[in-house]
């Protein structure tokens, strides 16, 4: 839970020629008030519900009477903030409409008359708990300057107001698995309490008291496995009694995306990829220009190139989509070589390299042998970020410093005796055996049971053994 706060700084003629006439006159004094309407930017409710996140109306401003012959100045404003409380999580991306209304205070029969002077709209990305964001919007010849922020109501904290904070029970530290609540370091994150009985394995909650099921599970406590074997279709609302998915329309059936948008299914709903010039959950918002601030995430808005797109968003690195609304998973392209770990920091990509590799993309194989010496005539061999020594005969160990006993591994078969030799080892075979390792039995008739032709030898070649 929390509150969206809007502070109107000024409302008056915009820059440039064609200043608007004052909305009030000596004959018709008037006063202004404002209405704000908020919708969750990417939620399903955005299209149908008028102000799904909430709406607020300001107080009336001071009565204003135009000075004859004077251009319309910035008009007197109502005092105070417009506050829109929200009960659930703050969505992060939201759409707003701010309307400037005129209340005429002349001698109208039936009380004051209201008329809409200007309406501005836009979509913004905003984290709860952040600083005031300033904005300027133009509507015709009028210009509205305002600031806004979203703040969480205790005990909620975090950029979406979904984490809960409680005063510490112990003065020194928080309970197991619970972090201190920044910036309120004297408070601790409170565990989120899901609905009683909610399956800890197959259920989760984003709000206290709810129980939402992971894919493949259903029922009020997410304890019923979804069985599709006896179902006609693996889609549709689940039946809590059978745990079977009742056939139903897919989220993209009938293409809910307007104005040529293309639909793709998501685990919980659908997503429209809108053509240029359109946005909204169903690509239903059009007639948008750069004045409406349609580019998110620091995208630069410039004019469109087609009659059906009044603007183009030039996205900063890491974002894409016709409104820069989609974060690019740049790590999915696996830019880090040689097993490096990819980290997308938003403003840049970083590769954390394995030992033995370096460079922005871990593309450089460090010289593992640099400064490494292999003793006793051994040669250094690079590989996989570590060096190893290929040792000369008679030596072993990591750096070839150990004198090897070639007979230690008992290489001579069938009771043969092993002798260490400067060039390696020699086997003295027991009677009835022959071969370099005494591996071949000698038959009584003098023929040996040698293989027909060892690899690399043709039949008939002389076969020499030590």
């Amino acid at each position: 839970a929390g509150v969206f706060e809007l502070q109107i700084h000024s409302f008056g003629p915009g820059p440039g020629p064609g200043a608007p006439r004052s909305p009030c006159s000596a004959r018709l004094p008037c006063r202004l008030f404002f209405r704000v309407c908020l919708k969750p930017g990417l939620s399903e409710e955005a299209a149908e519900s008028p102000c799904a996140l909430g709406a607020a109306l300001s107080a009336r401003g001071p009565v204003y009477t135009e000075q004859p012959g004077a251009p319309a100045p910035d008009l007197p404003l109502p005092d105070g903030l417009l506050q829109v409380p929200f009960r659930d999580a703050w969505p992060g991306t939201f759409s707003f409409i701010i309307e400037t209304w005129r209340e005429e205070l002349g001698d109208q029969i039936g009380g004051p008359a209201w008329s809409l002077l200007a309406r501005v709209a836009g979509r913004r990305r905003l984290a709860a708990g952040g600083p005031w964001a300033r904005d300027i919007q133009r509507a015709g010849a009028w210009e509205l300057r305002f600031s806004y922020r979203a703040r969480c109501e205790p005990p909620a904290v975090g950029t979406a107001c979904t984490r809960l904070c409680r005063p510490r029970s112990a003065p020194s530290r928080c309970g197991p698995g619970l972090r201190p609540c920044a910036p309120l370091e004297d408070e601790c994150e409170a565990p989120l309490v899901c609905r009683a009985g909610c399956s800890p394995e197959h259920g989760f909650c984003e709000q206290p008291g709810e129980c939402r099921c992971l894919e493949g599970w259903t029922g009020p406590l997410c304890t019923v496995p979804v069985s599709t074997s006896s179902c006609l279709s693996p889609r549709g609302p689940s039946s809590a009694t059978t745990g079977c998915l009742v056939p139903g329309p897919g989220p993209c059936d009938g293409n809910p995306c307007a104005n040529g948008g293309s639909c793709s299914e998501t685990p919980r709903s659908f997503e429209c990829t809108c053509p240029r010039g359109f946005y909204g959950l169903r690509c239903e918002v059009s007639g948008v220009t750069c004045a409406d601030g349609p580019c998110f995430n620091g995208g630069l808005c410039v004019g469109g190139a087609d009659p059906d797109s009044a603007y183009i968003c030039h996205c900063p690195p890491g974002f894409q989509g016709s409104n820069c609304e989609k974060r690019v998973d740049r790590c999915s392209l696996q830019p880090c070589r040689n097993g490096g770990l990819c980290l997308d920091l938003g403003h840049a990509l970083r590769c954390r390299c394995r030992a033995g590799f370096a460079g922005p993309r871990c593309e450089h194989d460090l010289d593992d042998c640099a400064g490494r010496a292999c003793a006793n005539g051994g040669t250094c061999v690079e590989g996989g970020g570590a060096h190893r020594c290929s040792c000369a005969l008679g030596f072993g160990g990591r750096d070839c410093r150990e004198r090897a006993d070639p007979c230690a591994a008992r290489p001579c078969a069938h009771g043969g005796r092993c002798y260490a030799h400067f060039s390696g080892l020699v086997c003295a075979c027991a009677p009835g055996y022959m071969g370099a390792r005494c591996e071949f039995p000698v038959h009584p008739d003098g023929a040996s049971a040698l293989p027909a032709a060892p690899p690399g030898l043709r039949p008939g070649d002389p076969q020499r053994y030590l």
């Epitope: 053509p275 750069c290 004045a291 630069l300 808005c301 410039v302 004019g303 469109g304 190139a305 087609d306 009659p307 030039h314």
Partner: antibody
Framework: EVQFQQSGPELVKPGASVKISCKAS????????IHWVRQSQGKSLEWIGL????????VYNQKFKSKATLTVDNSSTSAYMELRSLSSEDSAVYFC????????WGQGSTLIVSS | DIKMTQSPSSIYAFLGERVTITCKAS??????LSWFQQKPGKSPKTLIY???RLVGGVPSRFSGSGSGQDYSLTISSLEYEDVGDYYC?????????FGGGTKLEIK
């Protein structure tokens, strides 16, 4: 009638800078991007970048980012492109244009860089 | 950057002949493609935008088609005044990029 009037030919020395102007008329200047395009002798067209007079937004082709600076003066409905550190490779005809569906182009400004 | 490969680089055709020029993008450009005609010593003139929409005042013998990566400009019956250079331009993504051009001449 929509028109773009560009400044005349320029002969400059290597290392120098030059500023080409493009005066727009016949439409609401702030409503459309102004693009700049280069055409070297006997070559194809190259997009340098655009500027949106409404909000001053500029998008450069990275290839020209250190070469060109785009500006506008809304009061005179004029767009400008300054080219710096010129070399003989920058000798070309430079066009300003409204590269939208109607596609209006200036007549081109010839730049010759020679010592 | 998206690379636009235009072919052929030159065409010699008879008057009244049907002429087709193609442009291939290095990735899907979602029909954000224009065709331009440029006569010697003149500025380019836009013929087609959004792959197949004819600019007002352009003769109907010019037509554009294509989608995804492959696009073409067709002149149904070549006339003498159609001589010149033709370029495609993709405007799906910054930086905008032009094809290498096609020189069209009469046989």
């Amino acid at each position: 009638e929509v028109q773009f009037q560009q400044s005349g030919p320029e002969l400059v020395k290597p290392g120098a800078s030059v500023k080409i102007s493009c005066k727009a008329s016949g439409y609401t200047f702030t409503d459309y991007n102004i693009h700049w395009v280069r055409q070297s002798q006997g070559k194809s067209l190259e997009w340098i970048g655009l500027i949106y007079p409404f909000n001053g937004g500029i998008v450069y082709n990275q290839k020209f980012k250190s070469k060109a600076t785009l500006t506008v003066d809304n009061s005179s409905t004029s767009a400008y492109m300054e080219l710096r550190s010129l070399s003989s490779e920058d000798s070309a005809v430079y066009f300003c244009a409204r590269l939208n569906w109607e596609g209006y182009w200036g007549q081109g400004s010839t730049l010759i860089v020679s010592s | 950057d998206i690379k636009m490969t235009q072919s052929p680089s030159s065409i010699y055709a008879f008057l009244g002949e049907r002429v087709t020029i193609t442009c291939k993008a290095s990735q899907d450009i979602n029909s954000y493609l224009s065709w331009f005609q440029q006569k010697p010593g003149k500025s380019p003139k836009t013929l087609i935008y959004r792959a197949n929409r004819l600019v007002g005042g352009v003769p109907s013998r010019f037509s554009g088609s294509g989608s995804g990566q492959d696009y073409s400009l067709t002149i149904s019956s070549l006339e003498y005044e159609d001589v010149g250079d033709y370029y495609c331009l993709q405007y799906a993504e910054f930086p905008y990029t032009f094809g290498g051009g096609t020189k069209l001449e009469i046989k």
